[in-house]
Interface confidence: low
């Protein structure tokens, strides 16, 4: 007996071939011997089966001795043995129809779980293997669960159902609602304007919700709310903002915040949360601000950074076009009695310069100039 696998909602074509390459009489019946369809001369006749309107054939193939049964908009209950009677022969085809659905909405928040449920006909024992967009394979029976969805899980999940050494493939589009980056670091010299951007990693027609930025300054003992805002159909409106610092917020997506100037007391890390309408849970993005200051006081040239720096970062002071005078994995470096010239303070990570501040040291009778 031939086995054919079908997908719920799809169309399947079951083949039936006669030895004579001409139009002869044929009938398709189900396992209960109820006629589905057949022919009378060149006319297609239908029987009383529940398939009725969903069953068809290809009259153009009859003259070649081919009498297919086409079933549209497949249902799980269409799983059955179908019998083609032609030339005193009976050809049996077992049709097994499977469905695969996401248990909930296909738009899920980062960190939430995805459960895929397989609908299968009674008596079948399929195995399922799904491949996520990032190439991760998961296997299971009637249900497959993926906990802690990540941004890379957004996209088309390809699931293969295996039964009787035959397979059928399902594609399910999953959208993981998240910010493009889980975390970002902004490096600024003291006094510079700071731009924080929070691009979303998905696009939807209407986006409504509310958000807040909490900030933990390195110098502060506790965190505080810097700004709260609403989002209505992708339009941003500020609800409340602190006076110090007085953040400004863009009115359109992507979410965009401007800090008028980077100061050591603002250096630290923040957490922007966004609660979306009709979704449980929140989206999070961490943002970090590192501030650099280069100063000369009497005979001491100092370079300092504030904020969350990794121990791998290197802070250096060097006279322009010369080797670094001092390089340390610390948050402050200094040179006593610096020679005159343009000094560079560099914060770097494995050769990549993250932040650079220049300070001009004048001969000892003058005061320093900050370019």
């Amino acid at each position: 007996k031939k086995v054919v696998l079908g997908k719920k909602g799809d169309t399947v074509e079951l083949t039936c071939t006669a030895s004579q390459k001409k139009s002869i009489q044929f009938h398709w019946k189900n396992s209960n011997q109820i006629k589905i369809l057949g022919n009378q001369g060149s006319f297609l006749t239908k029987g009383p089966s529940k398939l009725n309107d969903r069953a068809d054939s290809r009259r153009s193939l009859w003259d070649q001795g081919n009498f297919p049964l086409i079933i549209k908009n497949l249902k799980i209950e269409d799983s059955d043995t179908y019998i083609c009677e032609v030339e005193d022969q009976k050809e049996e085809v077992q049709l097994l129809v499977f469905g695969l659905t996401a248990n909930s909405d296909t738009h899920l928040l980062q960190g939430q779980s995805l459960t895929l449920t397989l609908e299968s006909p009674p008596g079948s024992s399929p195995s399922v293997q799904c491949r996520s967009p990032r190439g991760k394979n998961i296997q299971g029976g009637k249900t497959l669960s993926v906990s802690q969805l990540e941004l890379q899980d957004s996209g088309t999940w390809t699931c293969t159902v295996l039964q009787n050494q035959k397979k059928v493939e399902f594609k399910i589009d999953i959208v993981v609602l998240a910010f493009q980056k889980a975390s970002s670091i902004v490096y600024k010299k003291e006094g510079e304007q700071v731009e924080f951007s929070f691009p979303l990693a998905f696009t939807v027609e209407k986006l409504t919700g509310s958000g807040e930025l909490w900030w933990q300054a390195e110098r502060a003992s506790s965190s505080k709310s810097w700004i709260t805002f609403d989002l209505k159909n992708k339009e941003v409106s500020v609800k409340r903002v602190t006076q110090d610092p007085k953040l400004q917020m863009g009115k359109k997506l992507p979410l965009h915040l401007t800090l008028p100037q980077a100061l050591p007391q603002y250096a630290g890390s923040g957490n922007l949360t966004l609660a979306l309408e009709a979704k449980t849970g929140k989206l999070h993005q961490e943002v970090n601000l590192v501030v650099m200051r280069a100063t000369q006081l009497q005979k001491n040239l100092t370079c300092e950074v504030w904020g969350p720096t990794s121990p791998k970062l290197m802070l250096s002071l060097k006279l322009e076009n010369k080797e670094a005078k001092v390089s340390k994995r610390e948050k402050a470096v200094w040179v006593l009695n610096p020679e005159a010239g343009m000094w560079q303070c560099l914060l770097s990570d494995s050769g990549q310069v993250l932040l650079e501040s220049n300070i001009k040291v004048l001969p000892t009778w003058s005061t320093p100039v900050q370019p």
Epitope: S310, P311, Q344, G351, Q352, V353, E356
Partner: antibody
């Protein structure tokens, strides 16, 4: 789309110099170090040095320090490497490369197609 | 300088089988819980292509049949199942210490 486009092959005489280019596109040129890597025919890879186009700061592999000079032109988003006093040992393919952004920030994620230098009398 | 020794220098693997390439460093390439070892694939006439960074992280766009493991001084690149297009030379590279250095390479042939 981040791309590094290198200049074409060079045939040079022993003792001469050669200057090759690496034009960057698809990102802010002054934000990332450009590295240079040497590969002799049928052999492995050797790091030559790096230049930070933002400030012009450069850093060299001590073993190759007097051979290469690295420069960068911010206006054209192009990095250059000049090799001097060429010998047959300098016949190789030279790649420019850039590191990645996130977890792969210490690996060469983007490469130029390479410039073949042949030193021959 | 940190010396990286790759083995074997060449290997031939049947289609669909597993290829294993080893890289030993002359000193530890670990720092603060991370391993600064990367793996590259290079085909003839092409630049190297990043496969694995920080010992075990798969670079975006690289098939999941490539995997990396190890820490300290001993690292491994695995390819399973090997496909015809995997015929290439593979290099390990450390980025913990300047100058960064590469292994001597392993040439993979598909049988």
């Amino acid at each position: 789309d981040i791309q590094l486009q290198q200049s074409g092959p060079e045939l040079v005489k022993p003792g001469a110099s050669v200057k090759m280019s690496c034009k960057a596109s698809g990102y802010t040129f002054t934000d990332y170090v450009i590295n240079w890597v040497k590969q002799r025919t049928g052999q492995g890879l050797e790091w030559i040095g790096e230049i930070y186009p933002g400030s012009g700061s450069d850093y060299y592999n001590e073993n190759l320090k007097d051979k290469a000079t690295l420069t960068a032109d911010k206006s054209s988003n192009t990095a250059y490497m000049q090799l001097s006093s060429l010998t047959s040992e300098d016949s190789a393919v030279y790649f420019c490369a850039r590191k990645g952004e996130n977890g792969n920030s210490l690996a060469f994620a983007y490469w130029g197609q390479g410039t073949l230098v042949t030193v021959s009398a | 300088d940190i010396v990286l020794t790759q083995s074997p220098a060449s290997l031939a693997v049947s289609l669909g089988q597993r290829a294993t390439i080893s890289c030993k460093a002359s000193q530890s390439v670990d720092y603060d819980g991370d391993s600064y070892m990367n793996w590259y694939q290079q085909k003839s006439g092409q630049p190297p292509k990043l496969l694995i960074y920080a010992a075990s992280n798969l670079e975006s766009g690289i098939p999941a049949r490539f995997s990396g493991s190890g820490s300290g001084t001993d690292f491994t690149l695995n390819i399973h199942p090997v496909e015809e297009e995997d015929a290439a030379t593979y290099y390990c590279q450390q980025s913990i210490q300047d100058p960064c250095t590469f292994g001597g390479g392993t040439e993979l042939e598909i049988k």
